[in-house]
């Protein structure tokens, strides 16, 4: 069985101010166990943008049925964007592991670039 | 407070249908995904169904193609519809609601099923 | 048939350290949880994910895991423990949800 890839199909987005910016992530395998999570930036300052497991991110929604047991989409949109919420943004497999769990596989990133709205 | 209040057991005969209803509260409904649980008298638990928020269902292998799990996220409400029924299906039926990772983190307190003639 | 396996009945001390052990599925494939059931009542969720305590659950109640095999441990049992235990477990590679056959707790 090969290796779980995440899938992070585009380099970059742009999306007007306002509108609402869609994060497009697949993973390969639905193993093994564990949670997928968005994060804009890399290293230890990243910030947190979904969490599949648990929070609340009342501007984020995803695009498939993640209550699904064969869901591999972990696609997501982000509502009422603006100039602030450019970068990059990283699509993050983990694996269960305790007492926490253990960063697995990383997409390749999405730039999201904001366009200002025309005045 | 999460509440699930499973209705519609009783006595039915071999070869009959009955339908169990979970009446949920005290969370979002459309959100979660939930199961049917069963435990026949002084056994252990059996999972019998799974569905999703979106509707996908998912059976164990003693009831496929007999048992229909569905929903009504209007109504917050599940649904079991049971057919061609055997004395293998007496039991205790429970409702539970799915953590993100499909294990139970609450239960209704059951509606017992007898099949019997 | 039970896919998950764990002893029929363990039996401890009141104060003593009760260990329940549950085997049967892969690690990278599953995800288990430990349910309480006293008689007459539903189960009760008291570890999820291997070793995740929900609110409300005593803090002597521990899960723990070693390749196929999770344990959950009671410290310092007490009367109000006695009860049948529970291994359920979510198989990514069914997608089912087998249990074990479970485990009576007596407290002596």
């Known amino acids: 069985e090969e290796e779980l890839q995440v899938i992070q199909p585009d380099k970059s987005v742009l999306v007007a101010a306002g509108e609402t910016a869609t994060l497009r992530c697949t993973a390969t395998s639905l193993i093994p166990v564990g949670p997928i999570q968005w994060f804009r930036g890399a290293g230890p300052g990243r910030e947190l943008i979904y969490n599949q497991k648990e929070g609340h991110f009342p501007r984020v929604t995803t695009v498939s049925d993640l209550t699904k047991r064969n869901n591999m989409d972990f696609s997501i949109r982000i509502g009422n964007i603006t100039p602030a919420d450019a970068g990059t943004y990283y699509c993050v497999k983990f694996r269960k592991g305790s007492p926490d769990d253990v960063e697995f596989k990383s997409g390749a990133g999405t730039e999201l670039s904001v366009r200002a709205k025309p005045s | 407070e999460v509440q699930l209040v499973e209705s519609g057991g009783g006595v039915v005969q071999p070869g009959g249908s009955l339908r169990l209803s979970c009446a949920a509260s005290?969370?979002?409904?459309?959100?979660?995904?939930m199961s049917w649980v069963r435990q026949a008298p002084g056994k252990g638990l059996e999972w019998v169904a799974g569905i999703s928020s979106g509707s996908d269902t998912y059976y164990g292998d003693s009831v496929k193609g007999r048992f229909t799990i569905s929903r009504d996220n209007s109504k917050n409400t599940l649904y079991l519809q049971m057919n061609s029924l055997t004395a293998e299906d007496t039991a205790v039926y429970y409702c539970?609601?799915?953590?993100?990772?499909?294990?139970?983190?609450?239960w209704g307190q059951g509606t017992l099923v007898t099949v019997s003639s | 048939s039970y896919e998950l396996t764990q002893p029929p009945s363990v039996s401890v001390s009141p104060g003593q350290t009760a260990r329940i052990t549950c085997s049967g599925g892969?690690?990278?494939?599953?995800?288990y949880a430990w349910y309480q059931q006293k008689p007459g009542q539903a189960p009760v969720l008291v570890i999820y994910s291997d070793d995740k305590r929900p609110s409300g659950i005593p803090e002597r109640f521990s899960g723990s895991s070693s390749g196929t095999t999770v344990t959950l441990t009671i410290s310092g049992v007490q009367a109000e423990d006695e009860a049948d235990y529970y291994c359920g477990g979510y198989d990514q590679s069914s997608y089912t949800n087998p249990f074990g056959g479970g485990t009576k707790l007596t407290v002596l």
């Open positions: 539970a609601r799915e953590t993100w990772n499909h294990l139970f983190d609450y």
């Open positions: 892969a690690y990278s494939s599953y995800y």
């Open positions: 005290g969370f979002t409904f459309s959100s979660n995904a």
